[in-house]
């Protein structure tokens, strides 16, 4: 008996071939001997089966001695043994229809779980293997679960169902809802305008929800909500914003925030959360602000940084085109009695400059100028 595997919702062609390469009489029946379809001369005739409106054949193939049964919009309950009667012979084909569905929505938040459930006909014992977009394989029986979805799990999951040495492949598109970056850091000189961007790692036609940016300034004892906003069909509208700092927000995606000027009291780290409509849980992105200030007070030239810096970052003070006068893994460095000239304060990581501030030291009878 020939075995054919089908997918729920798909179309399948069950073949039946006669030795004579011409149009002759044929009938397709199910295991209960109920006629599905056949021919009367050149006309297609249909029986009283439940497949009536979903069964078809191809007249053009009859002349070649082929009498296919085509079943559209397959259902699990179409799994059966189908019998083709032609030339006083009977050809049996066992059709097994499988379905594979995601437990809930195929749009899942980062960190959530994905469960894939296999629908199969009674008496079958299939095995399932799925391959994620990043090449991770998972195996199982009727259900497969993946916990803690990551951004790289977004894309097409390819699942293979094996039964009777035959296989059928399912493709399921999964979208992991997340920000492109889990964390970002912005380095700014005091007084500069600060741009924070929160690009999403997915695109959907309609995006609705609400969000908030909480900020923990390095100098503050507790965190504070800087801004709350709504998102309706990808349009952003501000609900509430603090007076200090007075953030501005872009009206379109990607989410974009502007801080008019970087000040030491704003240095710190924030957490932007986005709650999406009809989704449990929130998307998060951490954002950090490091602010640099170079000053000269009397005979002391000082460079300071505020905000979350890693211990391996180097802060240096150097006269332009000269070796660093002072270089430390600290958040403040200074030079006493600096020579006149253009001084540079540099924050660097393994030789790569992250932030630079210049200050002009005038001869001692003048006051310093900050360009």
């Amino acid at each position: 008996k020939k075995v054919v595997l089908g997918k729920k919702g798909d179309t399948v062609e069950l073949t039946c071939t006669a030795s004579q390469k011409k149009s002759i009489q044929f009938h397709w029946k199910n295991s209960n001997q109920i006629k599905i379809l056949g021919n009367q001369g050149s006309f297609l005739t249909k029986g009283p089966s439940k497949l009536n409106d979903r069964a078809d054949s191809r007249r053009s193939l009859w002349d070649q001695g082929n009498f296919p049964l085509i079943i559209k919009n397959l259902k699990i309950e179409d799994s059966d043994t189908y019998i083709c009667e032609v030339e006083d012979q009977k050809e049996e084909v066992q059709l097994l229809v499988f379905g594979l569905t995601a437990n809930s929505d195929t749009h899942l938040l980062q960190g959530q779980s994905l469960t894939l459930t296999l629908e199969s006909p009674p008496g079958s014992s299939p095995s399932v293997q799925c391959r994620s977009p990043r090449g991770k394989n998972i195996q199982g029986g009727k259900t497969l679960s993946v916990s803690q979805l990551e951004l790289q799990d977004s894309g097409t999951w390819t699942c293979t169902v094996l039964q009777n040495q035959k296989k059928v492949e399912f493709k399921i598109d999964i979208v992991v809802l997340a920000f492109q970056k889990a964390s970002s850091i912005v380095y700014k000189k005091e007084g500069e305008q600060v741009e924070f961007s929160f690009p999403l790692a997915f695109t959907v036609e309609k995006l609705t929800g609400s969000g908030e940016l909480w900020w923990q300034a390095e100098r503050a004892s507790s965190s504070k909500s800087w801004i709350t906003f709504d998102l309706k069909n990808k349009e952003v509208s501000v609900k509430r914003v603090t007076q200090d700092p007075k953030l501005q927000m872009g009206k379109k995606l990607p989410l974009h925030l502007t801080l008019p000027q970087a000040l030491p009291q704003y240095a710190g780290s924030g957490n932007l959360t986005l709650a999406l409509e009809a989704k449990t849980g929130k998307l998060h992105q951490e954002v950090n602000l490091v602010v640099m200030r170079a000053t000269q007070l009397q005979k002391n030239l000082t460079c300071e940084v505020w905000g979350p810096t890693s211990p391996k970052l180097m802060l240096s003070l150097k006269l332009e085109n000269k070796e660093a006068k002072v270089s430390k893994r600290e958040k403040a460095v200074w030079v006493l009695n600096p020579e006149a000239g253009m001084w540079q304060c540099l924050l660097s990581d393994s030789g790569q400059v992250l932030l630079e501030s210049n200050i002009k030291v005038l001869p001692t009878w003048s006051t310093p100028v900050q360009p």
Epitope: D10, T11, V12, E13, S42, F43, R58, S60
Partner: antibody, heavy 115, light 107 residues
Framework: QVQLQQWGAGLLKPSETLSLTCAVY????????WSWIRQPPGKGLEWIGE???????NYNPSLKSRVTISVDTSENQFSLKLNSVTAADTAVYYC?????????WGQGTLVTVSS | EIQMTQSPSSVSASVGDRVTITCRAS??????LAWYQQKPGKAPNLLIF???SLQTGVPSRFSGSGSGTDFTLTISSLQPDDFATYYC?????????FGQGTNLGIK
């Protein structure tokens, strides 16, 4: 809802090979037959040939010697190659799905053969 | 090979008119016939299949009849959207073939 999207070179010189591809989105690929049909400017429709997911083909005898239709089930795509084209092969080429009737159709690709 | 012949090649009519287009097969094709509508610059669209079955989404003013070699497409009350070219197609045997088309224009 099934959609067919086709693409390929629109301008050819005589004796070159016409090559078109049709991608099937949002529906079953197996169980159906996938056809190519052409329509010269201002004229009627001519069936070129068909293929199913397992690669079984039927061609129009008038074009059989020059036509190859192939299938890529992993991408849900099928392709047409027509060798040794002449000005008489200038037409809008359509891909379509069928069991017995052509539905739906691709958007069509105008292929012009000119020296 | 089966030849399909449509008549008339072109017809002019007014909104509200009843229009009939015929298609003749060079040999018996039972009811293995479809009708398509094509508008300029667009792909054909299936209207009727198996000679008389209306395709989902097609207005009920379209109907098909016939069997064997002679078939008819009828538009009971012509609407502005119906001005187009109409083709019949046989699915009885390879190679599939189409009629030469009937251009339905505004009178």
């Amino acid at each position: 809802q099934v959609q067919l999207q086709q693409w390929g070179a629109g301008l050819l010189k005589p004796s070159e090979t016409l090559s078109l591809t049709c991608a099937v989105y949002g529906g079953s690929f197996s169980g159906y037959y996938w056809s190519w049909i052409r329509q010269p400017p201002g004229k009627g429709l001519e069936w070129i040939g068909e293929i199913n997911h397992s690669g079984s083909t039927n061609y129009n005898p008038s074009l059989k010697s020059r036509v190859t239709i192939s299938v890529d089930t992993s991408e849900n795509q099928f392709s047409l190659k027509l060798n040794s084209v002449t000005a008489a092969d200038t037409a809008v080429y359509y891909c379509a799905r069928l069991v017995n009737w052509f539905d739906p159709w691709g958007q069509g690709t105008l292929v012009t053969v000119s020296s | 090979e089966i030849q399909m012949t449509q008549s008339p090649s072109s017809v002019s009519a007014s909104v509200g008119d009843r229009v009939t287009i015929t298609c003749r097969a060079s040999q018996d094709i039972s009811n293995w016939l479809a009708w398509y509508q094509q508008k300029p610059g667009k792909a054909p669209n299936l209207l009727i299949f198996a000679a008389s079955s209306l395709q989902t989404g097609v207005p009920s003013r379209f109907s098909g009849s016939g069997s064997g070699t002679d078939f008819t497409l009828t538009i009971s009350s012509l609407q502005p959207d119906d001005f187009a070219t109409y083709y019949c197609q046989q699915a009885n045997s390879f190679p599939y073939s189409f009629g030469q088309g009937t251009n339905l224009g505004i009178k």
